[in-house]
């Protein structure tokens, strides 16, 4: 009579995480008497998956009734597969012995590979803001996918980026993998409304890529441009000087007026005008009583934006000879008020 053979017909089985995996095994003979066991891995470190004789294996069910007379089918099904279940499974026949059963013959093994979806990509930007024309880095991470083959693309406002570096870890075989990518983006003044997208394609996603996004508004600082001008006034002894603060982002802005280097008034921008590109404008004015001055006045608009070093713009207010002659000791009035841009 031919000696018993253990047949595992599938060299490999591939299932999606969460599914059940059926591992097939058949014997060619009922002899010798003894149980079968399933192991993951081979050698001394192998892991017992199922023992026909004893034990509790809640995720394992047998495909056919093992106690049935003349049964030769020892296939099993493992439920709720995770990437950690990947490996080579061996169906092993034992011969009844005393006191212990003795391993008699093993199947060739079935490699179980688990296909797992990548996690939603998380995109993070730089810790500090940068100004236009500078380059900032964005990172994208996703974890837990298998197999290793994966595609990652970067987009800015729908346009594909090319300046990025991607790593998939680990480099060798693993039950699941992670991807990490860093993209370099050159900022432009119009990027307040811009968005970077990290797009991941993997065979488990059925053609629907996963996307992670980051807004460049979190990464950009657009410094303001200043313009100081004198507005025409009806009153001969008053001058209206305005400071137009244009195209800045983010909102945080503090403005100080100085007359001949002395602080006249400090104000925090509140009611701002938003431009189409997402930057802001603001205007402040200073009413100067020219009667209070015997000499020309240098008016300075000084702006501190987003905690950065102050920038300033000065304007020389000429006091006419007539006003110089009729100058008085009256304390000048200065009024500061925000208003809409011209």
């Amino acid at each position: 009579e031919d000696e018993l053979q253990v047949i595992q017909p599938e060299k490999s089985v591939s299932v999606a995480a969460g599914e059940s995996a059926t591992l097939r095994c058949a014997m060619t003979s009922l002899i010798p008497v003894g149980p079968i066991m399933w192991f993951r891995g081979a050698g001394a470190g192998r892991e017992l998956i199922y023992n026909q004789k004893e034990g509790h294996f809640p995720r394992v069910t047998t495909v056919s009734e093992l106690t049935k007379r003349n049964n030769l089918d020892f296939s099993i099904s493992i439920s709720n597969i995770t990437p950690a279940d990947a490996g080579t499974y061996y169906c092993v026949k034992f011969r009844k012995g005393s006191p212990d059963d003795v391993e008699f013959k093993s199947g060739a093994g079935t490699e179980l590979s688990v296909r797992a979806k990548p996690s939603a990509p998380v995109v993070s930007g730089p810790a500090v803001r940068a100004t236009p024309e500078h380059t900032v880095s964005f990172t994208c991470e996703s974890h837990g996918f298998s197999p290793r083959d994966i595609t990652l693309k970067w987009f800015k406002n729908g346009n594909e980026l090319s300046d990025f570096q991607t790593n998939v870890d680990p480099a060798g075989d693993s039950v699941s993998y992670s991807i990490h990518s860093t993209a370099r983006v050159v900022l432009t003044r119009g990027d307040v409304h811009s968005q970077v997208i990290c797009e991941i394609a993997h065979i488990t996603l059925q053609g629907d890529p996963l996307r992670g996004t980051a807004n460049l508004s979190e990464a950009i600082r657009v410094p303001p441009t200043l313009e100081v001008t004198q507005q025409p006034m009806r009153a001969e002894n008053q001058a209206n000087v305005t400071c137009q603060v244009s195209n800045f982002y983010p909102r945080g802005l503090q403005l100080t007026w100085l007359e001949n280097g002395n602080v006249s008034r400090t104000e925090t921008a509140s009611t701002l005008i938003e431009n189409k590109d997402g930057t802001y404008n603001w205007m402040s004015w200073l009413l100067v009583n020219t009667c209070a001055h015997r000499d020309d006045v240098v008016l300075t608009c000084q702006v501190e934006h987003d905690g950065q070093q102050a920038v300033s713009k000065s304007y020389a207010l000429e006091i006419s000879a007539h006003q110089k002659e009729h100058g008085s000791d009256i304390t000048h009035e200065a009024a500061l008020a925000p208003t809409a841009p011209l």
Epitope: S12, S14, D149, L205, D208
Partner: antibody, heavy 118, light 109 residues
Framework: EVQLLESGGGLVQPGGSLRLSCAAS????????MSWVRQAPGKGLEWVSI????????YNADSLKGRFTISRDNSKNTLFLQMNSLRAEDTAVYYC???????????WGQGALVTVSS | QAVVTQESALTTSPGETVTLTCRSS?????????ANWVQEKPDHLFTGLIG???NRTPGVPARFSGSLIGDKAALTITGAQTEDEAIYFC?????????FGGGTKLTVL
């Protein structure tokens, strides 16, 4: 049991339009990408189009130059192929096929014959 | 567009092992091409045998296996049977589209 059943084929004149349907049963359509593949008489297979599981993404053969549109109604478990500006060279048997993952054609329909002739 | 090339015809005997191959005009076939093998039997009956290079579709006999051999994808039938007589198509994925080979007519005599 997984089954794919194409319908809507027939004879159409050059320049005409036709809409093929593929009724899926035995599985949930939204969990799978689906594809159309065609076979001209006496020729090999030619890939036409893929619809992603959600239907939000499509992938099309460049050679068709936008004349064919793949779509799906996941609530009705049905895949469609809208074919416009048909030409004689579009005469073929059109098959819908399921992608087990995005990389694995596992089940195929029996095909629908489209004949473009005047 | 890439061209995928297969043997036009092969003949084998029952019980023999036969290997069908699939070559890409763009270079070596890799796992990223997700090689598929599809069987066509008379009356336009198509069955997906192998996907993703080496994954056998459930219900397909274990004698069918997929692999990469050198710079080509391969379908090996170990112990061919008369019912395996059919046309076998391979398909390769190129980033955003599939390309099918011309098919191999396998005769089992």
């Amino acid at each position: 049991e997984v089954q794919l059943l194409e319908s809507g084929g027939g004879l159409v004149q050059p320049g005409g339009s036709l809409r093929l349907s593929c009724a899926a049963s035995g599985f949930t359509l939204s969990s799978y990408a689906m594809s159309w593949v065609r076979q001209a008489p006496g020729k090999g297979l030619e890939w036409v189009s893929i619809s992603s599981g959600s239907g939000a993404n499509t992938y099309n053969a460049d050679s068709l130059k936008g004349r064919f549109t793949i779509s799906r109604d996941n609530s009705k478990n049905t895949l469609f192929l809208q074919m416009n500006s048909l030409r004689a060279e579009d005469t073929a048997v059109y098959y819908c096929a399921r992608l087990r993952f995005f990389d694995w054609f596992d089940y195929w329909g029996q095909g629908a014959l489209v004949t473009v002739s005047s | 567009q890439a061209v995928v090339t297969q043997e036009s015809a092969l003949t084998t005997s029952p019980g023999e092992t036969v290997t069908l191959t699939c070559r890409s005009s763009t270079g070596a076939v890799t796992t990223s091409n997700y090689a598929n093998w599809v069987q066509e039997k008379p009356d336009h009956l198509f069955t997906g045998l192998i996907g993703g290079t080496n994954n056998r579709t459930p219900g397909v006999p274990a004698r069918f296996s997929g692999s990469l051999i050198g710079d080509k994808a391969a379908l090996t039938i170990t112990g061919a049977q008369t019912e395996d007589e059919a046309i076998y198509f391979c398909a390769l994925w190129y980033s955003n589209h599939w390309v099918f080979g011309g098919g191999t007519k396998l005769t089992v005599l």
